[in-house]
């Protein structure tokens, strides 16, 4: 906490610029206008403040905003944005994509901090759900975000939105979260055609139940191997040598390489020893 | 509910062979979904699977130790059976038989039997 | 072999703390990775299974994450009951393995 002093004579701040620099902490608290910084905020990031006089701008708008920041100041926080904390940002009401835009570039390059998750939890919350837009830009900046989503968070995602999501979007999601967003994926891209189709849905069908692999495999999809080993277990041990055969098709020799692994292993185990014969590709069931 | 009950001699000389059955209550070892594991533990020690099996015959075994592991099904008694061929003083651990839920994972152990391999 | 490191072997926590204790497998297991909690004379109890589902009955301080190599086991308030053994387990492959084991001791 700085101490509250006088300001001396001629330094009185008249606009935020470069001068500023040379200011001593209990000058900057003595002499720049809380008001005159939050109107002039854009160009704070212009100037190269230390740390610790950062610390003093951040004083002086905690003590003009008692109840939080108004979107105004948010918006040009800039690198001001890492002296927050969750708690400061708690108290803030975001509703501009841009703004959150303008927050999340300060953050650019770096893992998710508490700050940013906070950010984007309220952004979230704001608006009652994850829309399009805001899902594009936040997997943008992280492409992990969606799976970073409880199941619950997952169930406000509407349908539209997916189609702003990637299949890196969906490397680190388990299957609860897959479980959510399948039923989504299918609605949206419920009107492509076959092949179409299959493309978008395909990094989504790690929560698909059998009766949807089972059509999939009257439709010469080719799934790929990658693709299969992400199938949930009950959704593959119901299904025919026969319908694995259709669902894979030119891939279907990928099965020996993946035998001792899960759901493959899960799957031959409980197939009979004729059936899986007729592959020709010696597994043991 | 099921539960799961190991039985067989506690101690064992060394180079003779280890004999241990598990026996299936409430429930069928014949389970379409479910495969029945061997764990053992040594005295202060860790958890190390030995292998599994399924009521059709197959099994799996612990790369480590399946020149000597046998595991077997008894549909007719609903039970699994374990057999380590030559023993030695490092096979002396708590044996443990259990069910693994494709779906989940090991959810029903027994509550486990010390065999010692002593002379 | 696929390998499964856990992280601590030992902590020593209070009632009321979070604890988290992380599991690495040596290749991908996808999410089939198991947590079990065993007390002294006891058979291990399933915690998790399939990396963040919550086995039936078991408390919902209780929580997993990850998927690939990288997996946690969090109690997000310790209690009485939770001063146990730790094991994690990968069922991916057909060797099925367990980590080493953390043991949650009381500060």
């Known amino acids: 906490e700085v101490e509250k002093t006088a300001c001396p004579s001629g330094k009185k701040a008249r606009e935020i610029d470069e001068s500023l620099i040379f200011y001593k902490k209990w000058e900057l608290e003595a002499c720049v206008d809380a008001a005159l910084l939050a109107t002039q905020m854009d160009r704070v990031n212009a100037i190269p403040f230390t740390y610790e006089q950062l610390d003093v701008l951040k004083h002086k708008l905690d003590e003009l905003y008692p109840q939080g920041y108004p979107e105004s100041v948010i918006q040009h926080l800039g690198y001001l944005f890492l002296k927050m904390s969750p708690e400061d940002i708690r108290k803030w009401n975001v509703t501009s994509l841009e703004t959150l835009k303008a927050l999340l570039e300060v953050n650019k390059g770096h893992e998710m901090s508490p700050q940013v998750a906070t950010l984007i939890d309220r952004f979230v919350k704001g608006r009652g759900q994850l829309d399009k837009d805001t899902l594009d830009t936040l997997t943008a900046f992280y492409p992990g975000y969606l799976c970073s989503l409880s199941p619950e968070e997952l169930s406000s995602v509407p349908p539209s939105s997916i189609w702003a999501v990637r299949p890196q979007d969906l490397d680190t999601c388990d299957p609860r979260q897959l479980d959510v967003l399948y039923p989504k994926a299918r609605l949206a891209f419920q009107n492509m055609n076959g092949s179409e189709y299959f493309v978008k849905i395909q990094s989504f069908l790690g929560g698909a139940p059998t009766e949807d692999l089972k059509a999939l495999s009257q439709q010469n999809v080719s799934m790929d191997l990658a693709t299969f080993m992400k199938l949930r277990t009950d959704a593959v041990l119901p299904l025919t040598v026969a319908e694995v055969q259709k669902l894979l098709g030119p891939h279907v020799e990928g099965l020996k390489a993946e035998e001792r692994h899960r759901p493959v292993r899960d799957w031959i185990l409980r197939q009979r020893q004729d059936d899986l014969d007729t592959l020709g590709l010696g597994l043991q069931g | 509910q099921v539960q799961l009950q190991e039985s067989g001699p506690g101690l064992v000389k060394p180079s003779e062979t280890l004999s241990l059955t598990c026996t299936v209550s409430?429930?069928?070892?014949?389970?379409?979904?479910?495969?029945w594991s061997w764990i053992r533990q040594p005295p202060g020690k860790g958890l190390e699977w030995i292998g599994y099996?399924?009521?059709?015959?197959?099994?799996n075994y612990n790369p480590s130790l399946k020149s000597r592991v046998t595991i077997s099904v008894d549909t007719s008694k609903n039970q699994f059976s374990l057999k380590l061929s030559s023993v030695t003083a490092a096979d002396t651990a708590v044996y443990y038989c259990a069910r693994e839920d494709a779906l989940t994972g090991f959810d029903i152990w027994g509550q486990g039997t010390m065999v010692t391999v002593s002379s | 072999d696929i390998q499964m490191t856990q992280s601590p072997s030992s902590l020593s926590a209070s009632v009321g703390d979070r604890v988290t204790i992380t599991c690495r497998a040596s290749?991908?297991?996808?999410?089939?990775l198991n947590w079990y909690q065993q007390k002294p004379g006891k058979a291990p109890k399933l915690l998790i299974y399939?990396?963040?589902s919550l086995q039936s009955g078991v408390p919902s301080r209780f929580s997993g994450s990850g998927s690939g190599t990288d997996f946690t086991l969090t109690i997000s308030s310790l209690q009485p009951e939770d001063f146990a053994t730790y094991y994690c387990q990968q069922s991916y492959d057909a060797s099925y393995t367990f980590g080493g084991g953390t043991k949650v001791e009381i500060k």
């Open positions: 399939a990396a963040s």
């Open positions: 099996i399924y009521y059709s015959g197959s099994t």
């Open positions: 409430g429930g069928s070892v014949s389970s379409y979904h479910d495969l």
């Open positions: 290749q991908s297991i996808s999410s089939y």
